[in-house]
């Protein structure tokens, strides 16, 4: 069974600046990754990034950086500042498309007892939905 | 079958603005950016910027900024680009397109004299 | 911003000729995670919107005659037409889709000879 694994960090250098990475477990081939927080796609949380493996990236503040880390994995950097930057429970969500398994999502957010610069490692988390 | 279906074109004078709208169908219309390109007569392709209709996030070309605006109606599928302070230079066909560029509408003819 | 430029400004090919269509950027377009070129090329007819041909830097958008192909990698890219036809007449644009801003060439005008 595929799996989706999110990884929340908050940076040491900068407090308020997050880096998300996201994976995948399964075979088939990446077609979509949707990152978004303040819970799932399309189910009240906000799009902060959408990864295409060919066409492109497309990502919006307070999305900094958003890049490919390997075929089946994406990191995103957030920036920290303003009204809609992160707090330390903000629910961050992955979700990825693939064939020919469906999709796949799983939501994270930073371990409570982390200190800055430390995560917990990347296991998979919790499969909240799988749209088949 | 996607399709992106902009509003007609339209005459301006120096200083006024142009709001046009670009009906989206045969897909998740929040779940893809809007883009906005315009081209004038003559001349190559340049992205003015792209707004998420889902939660109306939005990214602008620096040269833009502080003239356009995007924003988006969920409930209808359509998106919406409107430039002010218009000067001659902004006479130019105004693209909407979706999918990483996949799509296009037909083009919007904005022309601005006095 | 990333400078797209590409050569020759225009072009003149006969019919069943191969054309060829070179597309430089300022910075390096390969994303080196999942090594994949984020440059896309685009055929504009008079009067139409521009067409998605290529994207990817080599993946053929759907519908689009293999006669069409696209290489190239890192900051150099090609777009070639194996036998020119005259439904080919356009002008054609390559596009950084690495990073923001989206920055298109300047365009490249084919002709028949």
């Known amino acids: 069974t595929p799996e989706v694994w999110v990884q929340v960090r908050m940076e040491a250098t900068e407090l308020s600046s997050f880096t998300i990475r996201c994976g995948f477990l399964g075979s088939g081939s990446i077609s979509l990754v949707t990152v978004s927080w303040g819970g799932p796609n399309g189910a009240g949380g906000t799009t902060l990034a959408v990864l295409h493996p060919e066409r492109g990236i497309r990502q919006w503040a307070p999305a900094r950086q958003a890049r490919w880390e390997t075929q089946s994995s994406i990191s995103l950097i957030l920036e920290g500042s303003g009204a809609s930057s992160p707090c330390a429970n903000t629910t961050f969500c992955c979700k990825f498309a693939s064939f020919p398994e469906g999709s796949w999502e799983a939501c994270g957010s930073l371990p409570p007892s982390s200190d800055p610069g430390l995560s917990a490692p990347p296991t998979p988390a919790p499969i909240l939905r799988a749209d088949l | 079958e996607v399709q992106l279906v902009q509003s007609g074109a339209e005459v301006k004078k120096p200083g006024s603005s142009v709001k046009v709208s670009c009906k989206a169908s045969g897909y998740t219309f929040s779940s893809f950016s809007i883009e906005w390109v315009r081209q004038a007569p003559g001349q190559g392709l340049e992205w003015m910027g792209e707004?998420?209709?889902?939660?109306?996030?939005?990214n602008y070309n620096e040269k833009f900024k502080g003239r356009v605006t995007f924003t988006a109606d969920e409930s209808t599928s359509t998106a919406y680009m409107e430039l002010s302070s218009l000067r001659s230079e902004d006479t130019a066909v105004y693209y909407c397109?979706?999918?990483?560029?996949?799509?296009w509408g037909q083009g919007t003819l904005v022309t601005v004299s006095s | 911003d990333i400078v797209m430029t590409q050569s020759p400004d225009s072009l003149a090919v006969s019919l069943g000729e191969r054309a060829t269509i070179n597309c430089k950027s300022s910075q390096s377009l390969l994303n080196s995670g999942n090594q994949k070129n984020y440059l896309a090329w685009y055929q504009q007819k008079p009067g139409q919107p521009p067409k998605l041909l290529i994207y990817?830097?080599?993946t053929r958008e759907s519908g689009v005659p293999d006669r069409f192909s696209g290489s190239g990698s890192g900051t150099d890219f090609t777009l070639t037409i194996s036998s020119l036809q005259a439904e080919d007449v356009a002008v054609y644009y390559c596009?950084?889709?690495?990073?923001?801003?989206?920055?298109f060439g300047q365009g490249t005008k084919l002709e028949i000879k």
């Open positions: 397109s979706s999918y990483w560029f996949a799509y």
């Open positions: 596009q950084n889709a690495h990073s923001y801003p989206p920055t």
């Open positions: 990817g830097a080599s």
């Open positions: 707004i998420l209709p889902g939660s109306n996030s939005t």
